[in-house]
Amino acid sequence: SWMWNQFFLLEEYTGSDYQYVGKLHSDQDRGDGSLKYILSGDGAGDLFIINENTGDIQATKRLDREEKPVYILRAQAINRRTGRPVEPESEFIIKIHDINDNEPIFTKEVYTATVPEMSDVGTFVVQVTATDADDPTYGNSAKVVYSILQGQPYFSVESETGIIKTALLNMDRENREQYQVVIQAKDMGGQMGGLSGTTTVNITLTDVNDNPPRFPQSTYQFKTPESSPPGTPIGRIKASDADVGENAEIEYSITDGEGLDMFDVITDQETQEGIITVKKLLDFEKKKVYTLKVEASNPHVEPRFLYLGPFKDSATVRIVVEDVDEPPVFSKLAYILQIREDAQINTTIGSVTAQDPDAARNPVKYSVDRHTDMDRIFNIDSGNGSIFTSKLLDRETLLWHNITVIATEINNPKQSSRVPLYIKVLDVNDNAPEFAEFYETFVCEKAKADQLIQTLRAVDKDDPYSGHQFSFSLAPEAASGSNFTIQDNKDNTAGILTRKNGYNRHEMSTYLLPVVISDNDYPVQSSTGTVTVRVCACDHHGNMQSCHAEALIHPTGLSTGA
């Protein structure tokens, strides 16, 4: 049978001779040269050669474990005389043993990492890793130990894990932000003769909110014209914060001062400035200077740094209101006046007053905007603002007159303002009442006395304060001997009643009744209206059957016998 141990070979052999691997040997070998050893398989005849007489195997070339860690070859032992095998063809392994020919290589040539400023000592920063191509199962060729070559006393590295940690207290980003740390990885467990590789770790301290905002000056002054509408920016203030990002974000607020209600401050998110704006309308003539206390604060604070003091600062802002030439201001936003409709021309209705609000108190002249009074019904005294009529009025034509009055500064005609005037025309009893409609009625020939044949109603264009009160009566010339009577109902209506039993249409087919309607106002107004009454033949139900269309009308307008 075959007699051999496992074959090992050190890689990277540098000797001038072939490297001895080992010996193939059969227990059938008597040492007389009768056996021939044959080598075949992986690298046989090229990498590995055998002395066919002795069975000694040699390697002809430098072998690299990283290229191939194991070679499997076949061995044969043949009787030279018979040519027959004395041993079965068998396989064996030549294992390439590792030497330390690979330095540790970091997975990255440069690492980048961040760690918050002011971190506690021992805070994890980053883990670096180096790999070694040598055999980790054989010796210490691949056992890597990490050490720090540059970056102390700020950082340290764990020798076994490659974990980099902070090593110094109170590292302040505002003082120094960037650190370059050089880490060495050395194999052979870090011992002498070990191979090494290095990497650079660029560490950036990230910001924490350890700095409050600070105003660069304690007082700011801005000017703004009194005409600035609400929302107008007046000026910008900026507190500086040594932090960055959200830690440097600043919110501004007005905390005190007489201008608390008059001004606002808004934060410009892009520039981190505070913009002072007008909140309410300003008036130079009322107040010329305002003082505000403005506060700048960090919205994102870190509780662990609150011991450093409040994360806010305040400054005084002085706002000077500048005078603007303003148009005259009327004493009212609108005027409501009233006048009787019977007012004579040049009757004064009332007056308007406007004043220049500026300190100069420029005199003012008044005028009527003729676009609003095309018929020139009204006029105004340009000096004192008195409004008077220039035409007669009629309430029944127009109850309200809406006109506009203009006040203009005499010294500066560009400065003018307008005010609406609402003039109400008051009623005067200048219209007589009259029938609400034309009345033509009929009476049956067989009508009985005191029978109601028509109800009368009246209308009046006037609008008395206490309402209409009309009275109805027959005209005096028709009152005596009339065939009909008027009954005043005292409710602004009246009834026409028959005065006799029966009417003959052949005798008198039509009656004309003159009715006087009076109002109860002052001065009393009255009118006379005529009611036509036709005599008709009726059925027994009182329904009209036939009437004469013609009426005998006397020159006086009264029918005979009315």
Epitope: D46, E66, E67, K68, P69, V70, E91, I93, A133
Partner: antibody
Framework: QVQLLESGGGLVQPGGSLRLSCAAS????????MHWVRQAPGKGLEWVSF????????YYADSVKGRFTISRDNSKNTLYLQMNSLRAEDTAVYYC?????????????WGQGTLVTVSS | DIELTQPPSVSVSPGQTASITCSGD??????VHWYQQKPGQAPVLVIY???NRPSGIPERFSGSNSGNTATLTISGTQAEDEADYYC??????????FGGGTKLTVLG
């Protein structure tokens, strides 16, 4: 010419067994180490197992260790892969490949592959 | 143990040079082989021992290996070169490892 031809693939239930064969021709089969490599549908190549030229040495990927057995019959110029306790994740095309002398674990040539489907 | 990483895909215009990388720690110390696999076919060895071409493989295929990256280069890429490409090395003792594969697309 040098040729490898796999057979024995098919549909099998999880937990079942299958035996793949690889018939070699056109070269001295007994002089070469052989390998099995598989490829799941739409996925990359995964090495499965190795056997030395005379069958003295075998080696397996961790994913199949204890379940698959590689063997060869040099007299029949045939390589085998006995697969037991099959799982759904063993579904793949299985290739046999020759390890080329002097190339350092390079595979040339490869068989055309046989599909193994593990499904219930 | 070595882990091999390849880009999932690479695109190239016909006639241009395609470079497919295979990265792994200290890969330069290991022997790398490259295979081409076309759809429905078995893989074919195109480069062995980092930069050697088997007979029958066109001269436009070449390989290199340095640092942490091995590279397969196809100069003057042709439409027929469109395929999946795999790098391969040994992992530990007698085990073998493949890269995840790269799909090469020849545009146009």
């Amino acid at each position: 010419q040098v040729q490898l031809l796999e057979s024995g693939g098919g549909l099998v239930q999880p937990g079942g067994s299958l035996r793949l064969s690889c018939a070699a021709s056109g070269f001295t089969f007994s002089s070469y180490a052989m390998h099995w490599v598989r490829q799941a549908p739409g996925k990359g190549l995964e090495w499965v197992s190795f056997i030395s030229s005379l069958g003295s040495y075998t080696y397996y990927a961790d994913s199949v260790k204890g379940r698959f057995t590689i063997s060869r019959d040099n007299s029949k110029n045939t390589l085998y892969l006995q697969m037991n306790s099959l799982r759904a994740e063993d579904t793949a095309v299985y290739y046999c490949a020759r390890e080329t002398a002097g190339y350092g674990y390079a595979f040339d040539p490869w068989g055309q592959g046989t599909l193994v489907t593990v499904s219930s | 143990d070595i882990e091999l990483t390849q880009p999932p895909s690479v695109s190239v215009s016909p006639g241009q040079t395609a470079s497919i990388t295979c990265s792994g720690d200290n890969i330069r110390k290991y022997v790398v082989h490259w295979y081409q696999q076309k759809p429905g076919q078995a893989p074919v060895l195109v480069i062995y021992r980092d930069n050697n071409r088997p007979s029958g493989i066109p001269e436009r295929f070449s390989g290199s290996n340095s640092g942490n990256t091995a590279t397969l280069t196809i100069s003057g890429t042709q439409a027929e070169d469109e395929a999946d490409y795999y790098c391969q090395s040994w992992d530990s003792f007698l085990a073998v490892v493949f890269g995840g594969g790269t799909k090469l697309t020849v545009l146009g």
